[in-house]
Every structure is written in structure tokens, then in C-alpha cells.
């Protein structure tokens, strides 16, 4: 099917990097500056992606592969291929609509993104507060007065955060 | 191509004030929250306003508030920066950008950027 196809369709025979030029007889041109084609058999390059303003040109553009932003310092990438660049906030804050601000009482966020979540609540384990949480930090859990038994573990370590997402105020 | 071109930036004293716009194309200016950045000598990016697709909503960063207006015109396709009682700690290159989709409601990003204005305040 291949053979017959190539026979049939001159322009499958284009590699990636090239396309196939019907202005030239179908024949296989490279791709011109600032473009690209990733696969082959194609007529036309993709224009190459231009990493400006706010963010900053990860991997360059090659005849065979579109250019990667990432985000200028101070920002990170959302969305498919860093479509959009977000600030950065510090930790034990949360990005709202007026900007960074402090996580409340009772929440914490240990990351510069994300949203400010709240601290573990150890009673619900039966355990007790060993290390009082912080805006930038969880509780740490300890055992409750119970277990304080010879051989007892010391020590439990809060529950796993859920992956940040972002809700604004 | 989609574009922003800010303009109205200079030397100022200062208690003086400029207004700043951003005239944008290439897209549909109304369907987007718009927003300044702004970037000190040696300093990183600092967000300073931003406004709603309709205009109903604005919000500033603390230092400016009082201060500086956001404020846009959609059938001009523009967004401006009206600067009063500016102080030398205003001192930078102000940029304009567009809010990606759902900005505001999952997100605060931006995703067109402006070449910037430089704003001076000195006497």
C-alpha cells in the first residue's frame, strides 16, 4: 500500500524538515527559515512558534520540530505547551484577583503556585498537634496522649496534599 | 498576528501624572481580561491592574491603588493606564497583556505581551 501510495502521491516521499512544493513541480523543498514540518508528506511548514514577552524560548525551532517556551523568572507555565505564563506567588500565599495574599489562618500552601489549602486536622485521626502549622507549612500530627506507651512511634506525618489546583477569590 | 503596542510613557516629576495605553489587534479585544505589568530597574515582573472584558471589574495591586486607573475602550480595541501622584518608586517599564481563556475564573494567565513603555519618575 505504501509503494503504491508513493507512486500514486509524489509529495509522501517528503521528509520531515521539507514539503512539497507545487509551485515546483512537486518536488521537495526545505523548510524556509523560521518553519518547520514534523512530519513527512506535507505541503505546506508550520510557522515556528516565537517565545516573547513573559516568556523565554526553552528549545529552539528546527526545520523538523517547533519551538518550546517556558516562563520568564517570577512566572510558570499553564496549560498544553506552556500555552500561558502565571506570577508566582511565595509560599503561605495564593494568587487572587488582587494578587498575592497571605494564606488565612488554618491553611498553608508550600508552594510558590496553587491555592492555599487546609492545615490536617489531626483529631480526626485521633492523634494530637505536634508541631502547630504555619501559612507556609502543615501541622505536624503526633500520637495521641494515649499511645504515649513505651515503643509507641512518635511520630505520624500528615496526609498527602491534594494536587494544587487554582480557585481564585 | 495578534499584537499589543503600548505607548504614553516618558519623564515625569515627581506628584505628576501619564497615561499610559495599550492598543491591541489580531484578536477579539472584548473577549479577554487585560492586564498591566510592570518592571523595576534590576527588579522582576510586578503585576499592577487588570480589568474585566466589559470593564465591570478592576482590580490593583496595594502600592498603586488610590493611584493609578485601569480602564479600557473596546471599540478602540485599547486599555489604559491613567498614573496620578507618581513616585519615583514607579519608576519602570510597564507592559500590557492579554489574559489567556478563563482567566479570572481558573487562572491568572497571560499569554500575548506587549514591547513595553518606560515610565521615569525623577525631578
Known amino acids: 500500500f505504501e509503494r503504491t501510495r508513493s507512486l500514486q502521491d509524489p509529495c509522501s516521499n517528503c521528509p520531515a524538515g521539507t514539503f512539497c512544493d507545487n509551485n515546483r513541480n512537486q518536488i521537495c523543498s526545505p523548510c524556509p527559515p523560521n518553519s518547520f514540518s514534523s512530519a513527512g508528506g506535507q505541503r505546506t511548514c508550520d510557522i515556528c512558534r516565537q517565545c516573547k514577552g513573559v516568556f523565554r524560548t526553552r528549545k529552539e525551532c528546527s526545520s523538523t520540530s517547533n519551538a518550546e517556551c517556558d516562563c520568564t523568572p517570577g512566572f510558570h507555565c499553564l496549560g498544553a505547551g506552556c500555552s500561558m505564563c502565571e506570577q508566582d506567588c511565595k509560599q503561605g500565599q495564593e494568587l487572587t484577583k488582587k494578587g498575592c495574599k497571605d494564606c488565612c489562618f488554618g491553611t498553608f500552601n508550600d508552594q510558590k503556585r496553587g491555592i492555599c489549602r487546609p492545615w490536617t486536622n489531626c483529631s480526626l485521626d485521633g492523634k494530637s498537634v505536634l508541631v502547630n502549622g504555619t501559612k507556609e507549612r502543615d501541622v505536624v500530627c503526633g500520637p495521641s496522649p494515649a499511645d504515649l506507651s513505651p515503643g509507641a512511634s512518635s511520630v505520624t506525618p500528615p496526609a498527602p496534599a491534594r494536587e494544587p489546583g487554582h480557585s481564585p477569590q | 498576528e495578534v499584537q499589543l503596542v503600548e505607548s504614553g510613557g516618558g519623564l515625569v516629576q515627581p506628584g505628576g501624572s501619564l497615561r499610559l495605553s495599550c492598543a491591541a489587534s489580531g484578536f477579539t479585544f472584548s473577549s479577554h481580561w487585560m492586564t498591566w505589568f510592570r518592571q523595576a530597574p534590576g527588579k522582576g515582573l510586578e503585576w499592577v491592574a487588570h480589568?474585566?472584558?466589559?470593564?465591570?471589574?478592576?482590580y490593583y495591586e496595594d502600592s498603586v491603588e488610590g493611584r493609578f486607573t485601569i480602564s479600557r475602550d473596546n471599540a478602540k480595541n485599547s486599555v489604559y493606564l491613567q498614573m496620578n501622584s507618581l513616585r519615583a518608586e514607579d519608576t519602570a517599564v510597564y507592559y500590557c497583556?492579554?489574559?489567556?481563556?478563563?482567566?479570572?475564573?481558573?487562572?491568572?494567565?497571560?499569554?500575548?505581551w506587549g514591547q513595553g513603555t518606560t515610565v521615569t519618575v525623577s525631578s
Open positions: 480589568i474585566k472584558e466589559d470593564g465591570s471589574e478592576k
Open positions: 497583556a492579554r489574559g489567556g481563556d478563563g482567566y479570572s475564573d481558573s487562572h491568572f494567565g497571560v499569554d500575548v
